[in-house]
């Protein structure tokens, strides 16, 4: 329960002394304005929208949006006693560039197409920037142009800056082991973090630890090896602080800029330097198959910040922090690249989530346990001799699981020459593959045989 | 750097047993498994099991199981292979070898060697 | 079992030469390993992934192949190159082929 004394809002009439969830109507999954709370502060409630009417009856208005009478100034308790309505205006009024390429008059015309993205299920719309997409901005009033502090760039986007850390399988006892760590930065509210792709490379579990020591099992949306740009996802509740792209297109020689990175938990390490160069060839560094043009700086990057962004003093991000080639010179992915890469994934998750097809063999299975092995050994005298791997319960007929030679009883031991410890494993192998080489221990025979997944519609 | 150094060879009756250590320095020794592989005259190099040092967990190949147990100490970083009920077809040398991993596939395979353990099955 | 094939088992050939090991196997693996073994010492690897070469191995060694096939190249062959060569592959669990040994004419 809220104590009354923990809200900041003046007390509309009847509100109660305590607030009690329990008490809150049940509200509509999507709300078109975004959520915000009631009159009294206790309950989430639909906001209204931009340019809606808002104050008296109708309500408060959504998130990132404040009531406004036709005067300009923000509906108070004294306004609304005078009973006079408002409209719901955005509190940010600058244009913002979209991850789907689109400029937004504001912040809330962005958060609204998001929300209308979401609930055709297609990827949500994220901050790129400020200022419009592709358009140049220079603000003579702007940190980067007045001062010099490092210190202050550092304490507005540590927040942002994540200690990314990956665990291994060990081949036989399945126990997970760390084997690399590197960072990375968030890029939206809802938990996409941006980092290299080698710092994410396949196979891993990855793992996501937030600068208040949050951590979270992290999901690959996207990578482009040859970029070295890798998207991930964390389920988060609530807001995420965001850092936004700057344009590396802009960089001068001779700008200052902050290598920032999460090499441990709870702690960020900072480095700082210059642009040497903003365009140097990946070929001229001796990079395999890179032809990507990189921004050269004497700012340290080394293993503990790579994966970080590199920022500007205005704290937007100018590059991912990539490598080190010799002592002073190091190099980062350059934003614009980053842009590129944000816009192209979201275009190809909206397109893919439009054409996501199912694999399915046609088997019901269950990983098996020891104790189930032995259960079904004490039934089964011919059960195999295995304590781990996938066990078939049944195969359906007309399926690829029976065109491959699966049978009842068969347990999984490994596909593609990767060990089955578990059904899911085994669902994994589905998803990723076009062809399961599969070993399957039959009595206390191991037997090879190979199936095809075949694709359905959800 | 990482080592792995085996006991010294030995010389046992049919029907008896044999116990080869092998120790490990240069790494965390409860991060990576320990296997066996052993090699007969003239023969291939064949996969005996292995042990996750951390917990204990085993894993055995089926044409060793039930004369084969692999243990470890984690406190002396030390793994062991015991052999029972010899016969002469198990003269050959022993070798403990680290599960390696390949970061960039996720592949397994074995990057370090012990020099090897001598056993000589005979009457 | 996944049943190993390697070839041949033995072959002699002269410095300089390029000399080439195949191992096949009776069912897709994902990767092949290569080691090296000189006589009285233990086995050394030198091709991990199918393709990528161990550390300090040098540049004339190399692996290739895919599925059910692999092929290991050396491609100037050099005095000290004499040993036996062993592919493995690791599925549910660890097998080696039977060996290659290599002489020098």
């Known amino acids: 329960q809220l104590s009354r004394a923990g809200r900041s809002a003046p007390l509309a009439a009847g509100c109660p002394d305590r607030c009690e969830p329990a008490r809150c109507p049940p509200q509509p999954e999507h709300c078109e304005g975004g959520r915000a709370r009631d009159a009294c502060g206790c309950c989430e409630v639909c906001g209204a929208p931009e340019g809606a009417a808002c104050g008296l009856q109708e309500g408060p208005c959504g998130e990132g949006l404040q009531c406004v009478v036709p005067f300009g100034v923000p509906a108070s308790a004294t306004v609304r006693r005078r009973a006079q309505a408002g409209l719901c205006v955005c509190a940010s009024s600058e244009p913002v560039c979209g991850s789907d390429a689109n400029t937004y008059a504001n912040l809330c015309q962005l958060r609204a197409a998001s929300r209308r993205s979401e609930r055709l299920h297609r990827p949500p719309v994220i901050v790129l920037q400020r200022g419009a997409c592709g358009q140049g901005q220079e603000d003579p009033n702007s940190l980067r142009h007045k001062y010099n502090f490092i210190a202050d760039v550092v304490e507005k986007i540590a927040p942002a800056v994540v200690h990314i850390e990956l665990f291994r399988k060990l081949p036989f006892s399945k126990r997970e082991v760390p084997v690399a760590s590197g960072s990375g930065f968030i890029v939206s509210e809802d938990g996409l973090i941006v980092t290299n792709a080698h710092v994410v490379t396949n196979k891993h579990r990855v793992k996501v630890e937030l600068k208040n020591g949050a951590t979270y099992e992290a999901k690959i949306k996207d990578v482009d090896e040859k970029a070295d740009i890798a998207l991930i996802k964390i389920d988060h509740q609530g807001k995420l602080p965001v850092l936004l792209l700057g344009r590396s297109s802009e960089l001068r020689p001779g700008e200052f800029v902050v290598a920032i990175g999460s090499p441990f938990s709870l702690q960020n390490t900072v480095t700082t330097g210059i642009v040497s160069t903003t365009q140097r060839g990946g070929k001229e560094l001796g990079l395999r198959n890179s032809d990507m043009d990189y921004i050269q700086t004497d700012a340290i990057i080394n293993y503990g910040n790579s994966g970080g962004p590199l920022v500007n003093l205005d704290g937007e991000v100018i590059g991912i922090n990539t490598l080190k080639v010799t002592a002073g010179i190091s190099f980062a992915i350059p934003s614009d690249k980053i842009k590129k890469f944000l816009t192209e994934s979201h275009d190809r998750q909206a397109k893919g989530k439009a054409i996501t097809k199912k694999k399915y063999i046609g088997i019901r299975m269950m990983s098996l346990t020891s104790s189930k092995a032995k259960e079904l050994k004490d039934r089964h005298r011919d059960f195999p001799d295995v304590i781990s791997g996938a066990y078939i319960i049944e195969v359906i007929p007309d399926t690829p699981a029976e065109a491959g030679g699966l049978k009842e009883n068969d347990v999984i031991i490994s596909i593609n020459g990767q060990s089955v410890v578990s059904a899911n494993d085994v669902s994994d192998v589905i998803k990723r593959e076009s062809t399961l080489n599969m070993v399957v221990r039959r009595g206390n025979e191991d037997i090879m045989i190979t199936v095809i997944p075949e694709e359905i519609d959800p | 750097q990482v080592q792995l150094v085996q006991s010294g060879a030995e010389v046992k009756k049919p029907g008896a047993s044999v116990k080869v250590s092998c120790k490990a320095s240069?790494?965390?020794?409860?991060?990576?498994?320990m296997h066996w592989v052993r090699q007969a005259p003239g023969q291939r190099l064949e996969w005996m099991g292995a042990?996750?040092?951390?917990?204990?967990?085993?894993a055995y190949n089926q044409k060793f199981k039930g004369r084969v147990t692999i243990t470890a100490d984690k406190s002396a970083s030390t793994a062991y292979m015991e052999l029972s009920s010899l016969r002469s077809e198990d003269t050959a040398v022993y070798y403990c070898?680290?599960?390696?991993?390949?970061?960039?596939?996720?592949?397994?395979?074995?990057?370090?060697w012990g020099q090897g353990t001598l056993v000589t099955v005979s009457s | 079992d996944i049943q190993m094939t390697q070839s041949p088992s033995s072959l002699s050939a002269s410095v300089g030469d390029r000399v080439t090991i195949t191992c096949s196997v009776s069912?897709?693996?994902?990767?092949m390993y290569w080691y090296q073994q000189k006589p009285g010492k233990a086995p050394k690897l030198l091709i991990y992934?199918?393709?990528n070469l161990a550390s300090g191995v040098p540049s004339r060694f190399s692996g290739s192949g895919s599925g059910t096939d692999f092929t290991f190249t050396i491609s100037s062959l050099q005095p000290e190159d004499i040993a036996t060569y062993y592919c493995?592959?690791?599925?549910?669990?660890?097998?080696f082929g039977q060996g290659t040994k290599l002489e020098i004419k």
């Open positions: 992934d199918t393709s």
């Open positions: 070898t680290r599960e390696g991993y390949s970061y960039e596939g996720g592949g397994y395979y074995f990057d370090y």
């Open positions: 240069g790494y965390t020794f409860t991060d990576y498994e």
């Open positions: 493995q592959q690791w599925a549910s669990y660890p097998t």
């Open positions: 069912s897709s693996v994902s990767y």
């Open positions: 042990i996750d040092p951390e917990t204990g967990g085993t």
